[in-house]
């Protein structure tokens, strides 16, 4: 689509005569008829296949024609066409005398013709005007002409349609040849693809407008090159998304178990020494004179029950003193003046003579102890419960109350972290000393196989004819976006040529 433009510049008819040689009365009021048609070796009458146009009266006898001539006419004259410019043409320009105001062909006598010129030739599309002058015996016409493309049409023959746009469907202007020229920040065949912030990570980042860098799930930062730790992570970092790699002093799946309780909480009092003993547990070694889990209690010398055989203890400035019951003596009432005849064994203990009856020994029944079987056995004194379990006396037996994560009579067994099936999407769980580990099936990753890793179905370049390939993340298959003129699941068929 384009326009043939004809610029009339000067017409000379000095004698003011018609083509017949007869003079115009009072002078030749001149207007022009223009016919544009396909190339003919010899220009003949017939339809103006490329268009025609008439002017109003432009002057009398000899005159120059101004641009945008008054009287409702246009100069240059416009002959639009809506086809591919063929590069050749025929042009007929007739000068006519208008005796009255009616310029229609049927209103004019045939002998009102002043002159007629016909030219033909090649003409390329372009901005430059071709200047021409045609002379007959009585008249001379000077004019110029050119062919230009209509708005939004480009190329050697005005056949390429290109309309600049800046919207969802493209961001471009048009070059003289009709090719697209992307606006700054856009790329791609139709300039629909934004150019992301320089350095934006190719896989982890994307953008919806130029110079942007938006991160895909699991990534953060200006260039989307930093991972985000797991949602439940407390004191950990990551090297890939959703990991939870514990900071120093923290343990557990979510790094929420304090392995350095001593440093973080300073639980031991009165100058005691603190030792970390596992997750959130510690042991305080008390200085002399202190007791309690955190060495928070001041120790009385008598608190250790030093007096035996029922002796009573009295605190003194320099220590303690045992008041012994009848039949006993010594610093701790440990010596007896009794014999088996005095029935010294309590709680069903049996008495055995020693040193020819000068002393005795008691053999105690289960659950009792002491030199006279006077003490009930505390089965928890030996701290039998492992891994921080709490010991409870239960009649003749004892039991251990275990901390979370441990089981067994003595809390000696670690409960499997895998018992609660923490691995998603069919991952295989492995118990490790440091916690659990999931081995993920293809297509999944992350600490618990919770991150779906897309398979790049486009890696094999399945799309033809410069089609754009996309991976359908829900099915891990490819989708081809065909360029204009091609169809098929791989864009392998030109339009109009169905598969054989």
């Amino acid at each position: 689509s384009g326009v043939f433009q004809l610029q009339l510049q000067e017409f000379v008819n000095e004698r003011g005569v018609l083509a017949s040689g007869r003079p115009c009365e009072p002078g030749c009021r001149t207007f022009f008829r223009v016919c544009l048609k396909h190339f003919q070796a010899v220009v003949s009458p017939g339809p103006c296949t490329f268009g025609s146009v008439s002017t109003p009266v432009l002057g009398t006898n000899s005159f120059a024609v101004r641009d945008d001539s008054s009287g409702g006419g246009r100069n240059p004259l416009q002959l639009p066409f809506n086809f591919t410019w063929p590069g050749t043409f025929s042009l007929i320009i007739e000068a006519w005398h208008a005796p009255g105001d009616d310029l229609r062909p049927e209103a004019l006598p045939p002998d009102a013709l002043i002159s007629k010129i016909a030219i033909q030739g090649s003409l390329a599309v372009g901005q430059n005007w071709l200047l021409d002058e045609q002379t007959s015996t009585l008249t001379r016409l000077r004019y110029s002409y050119r062919v230009i493309c209509s708005d939004n049409y480009y190329g050697d023959n005005c056949s390429r349609l290109c309309k600049k746009r800046n919207d969802h469907f493209g961001h471009y202007v048009c070059q003289p040849d009709g090719n697209l020229s992307c606006l700054p920040g856009w790329t791609g065949e139709y300039c629909q693809q934004p150019i992301c912030l320089s350095g934006c990570h190719e896989q982890n980042g994307y953008c919806s407008k130029p110079a942007e860098c938006l991160c895909r799930p699991g990534w953060q930062g200006r260039l989307c090159n930093e991972c985000i730790p797991h949602n439940g992570c407390r004191h950990g970092t990551c090297s890939t998304p959703w990991q939870c790699t514990c900071d120093e002093g923290w343990g557990g799946l979510f790094c929420d178990q304090d392995l350095n309780y001593c440093t973080h909480h300073s639980p031991c009092k009165n100058g005691a020494t603190c030792s970390n003993s596992g997750q959130r547990s510690y042991t305080c070694t008390c200085r002399p004179g202190y007791t309690g889990v955190d060495c928070e209690l001041e120790l009385s010398e008598c608190d250790s029950n030093p007096c035996r055989n029922g002796g009573s203890c009295k605190d003194q400035e320099d220590g303690y003193h045992c008041l012994c019951p009848p039949g006993y003596y010594g610093l701790h009432c440990e010596h007896s003046t009794l014999s088996c005849a005095d029935s010294p064994c309590f709680n069903g203990g049996s008495c055995r003579e020693r040193n020819q009856g000068a002393s005795y020994a008691c053999e105690c029944p289960p659950n009792f102890t002491g030199s006279n079987c006077e003490k009930k056995v505390d089965r928890c004194t030996s701290n039998p419960c492992a891994n921080g379990g709490q010991c409870l006396n239960r009649g003749p037996s004892r039991m251990c109350r275990c901390r979370p994560g441990f089981t067994g009579t003595y809390c000696e067994r670690h409960v499997s972290d895998c018992a609660r099936n923490p691995c998603a999407h069919g991952g295989t769980c492995h118990d490790l000393e440091s916690g659990l580990m999931c081995t993920c099936p293809a297509g999944f990753s992350g600490r618990r196989c919770e991150v779906r890793t897309s398979i790049d179905a486009c890696a094999s370049s399945p799309c033809f004819n410069r089609a754009t390939c996309y991976t359908d993340l829900s099915t891990d298959t490819f989708v081809c976006n065909c360029p204009y003129g091609f169809v098929g699941s791989r864009c392998e068929f030109p339009v109009g040529l169905p598969p054989s």
Epitope: S208, L214, C215, R216, P217, G218, W219, Q220, G221, R222, E226, I228, P229, N231, G232, C233, R234, H235, G236, T237, D247, A424, E450, V451, R452, L473, S474
Partner: antibody, heavy 118, light 107 residues
Framework: EVQLVESGGGLVQPGGSLRLSCAAS????????MAWVRQAPGKGLEWVAT????????YYRDSVKGRFTISRDNAKNSLYLQMNSLRAEDTAVYYC???????????WGQGTLVTVSS | DIQMTQSPSSLSASVGDRVTITCRAS??????LAWYQQKPGKAPKLLIF???ILADGVPSRFSGSGSGTDFTLTISSLQPEDFATYFC?????????FGQGTKLEIK
């Protein structure tokens, strides 16, 4: 235990400013991206802004761009939201949350009410 | 922006009932969907992320399913403490957007 405690809310006139703070504890604050999410009275939840953990990259919803600024002080375990040119439609309970624009919000504060009214 | 549409907007049920709440996205959001529970005057609490992964400490009666545009939150046997408002949220596109909420009430 993870704790996020917001403060700084209150009544402000249209066009006025307010600065919200969020004190974080129970996790290593500097390791995690943070966000502000708001909830207008009786309405749903609306993401407002996000800041990354290390380089402090920020993102905002379109309606607050140029008016709100999210920032953090890792040394103080604190998150902030500076709100300028406040409008009636900014009236909401503002929650401090741990998360990014592309991840779930794993932990939330109790919220602080911002009322914009003349 | 991606529109998230929850249904129903409110729901009455009894303790022990099985309850299902659905959430539809206006575009494919893959598996990037979370569910939250919110009680009056309280902050939301994360229940489920990545469509079906239970957040730490969330009872196993809660479960999630779906992909693409259609997602479901199921509570297998309602407990008294489950009566609350539930929100879905997509985090596949910027800005992240929430559903309008489903209020679960005692029948």
């Amino acid at each position: 235990e993870v704790q996020l405690v917001e403060s700084g809310g209150g009544l402000v006139q249209p066009g006025g400013s307010l600065r919200l703070s969020c004190a974080a504890s129970g996790f290593t604050f500097s390791n995690f991206p943070m966000a502000w999410v708001r909830q207008a009275p009786g309405k749903g939840l609306e993401w407002v802004a996000t800041i990354s953990s290390s380089d402090g990259t920020t993102y905002y919803r379109d309606s607050v761009k140029g008016r709100f600024t999210i920032s953090r002080d890792n040394a103080k375990n604190s998150l902030y939201l500076q709100m300028n040119s406040l409008r009636a439609e900014d009236t909401a309970v503002y929650y401090c949350a741990r998360g990014y624009y592309n991840s779930p919000f794993a932990y939330w504060g109790q919220g602080t009410l911002v009322t914009v009214s003349s | 922006d991606i529109q998230m549409t929850q249904s129903p907007s409110s729901l009455s049920a009894s303790v022990g009932d099985r309850v299902t709440i659905t959430c539809r996205a206006s575009q494919d959001i893959y598996y990037n969907l979370a569910w939250y529970q919110q009680k009056p005057g309280k902050a939301p609490k994360l229940l489920i992320f990545d469509t079906n992964i239970l957040a730490d400490g969330v009872p196993s009666r809660f479960s999630g399913s779906g992909s693409g545009t259609d997602f479901t939150l199921t509570i297998s046997s309602l407990q008294p403490e489950d009566f609350a408002t539930y929100f879905c949220q997509q985090y596949d596109y910027v800005p992240p957007t929430f559903g309008q909420g489903t209020k679960l009430e005692i029948k």
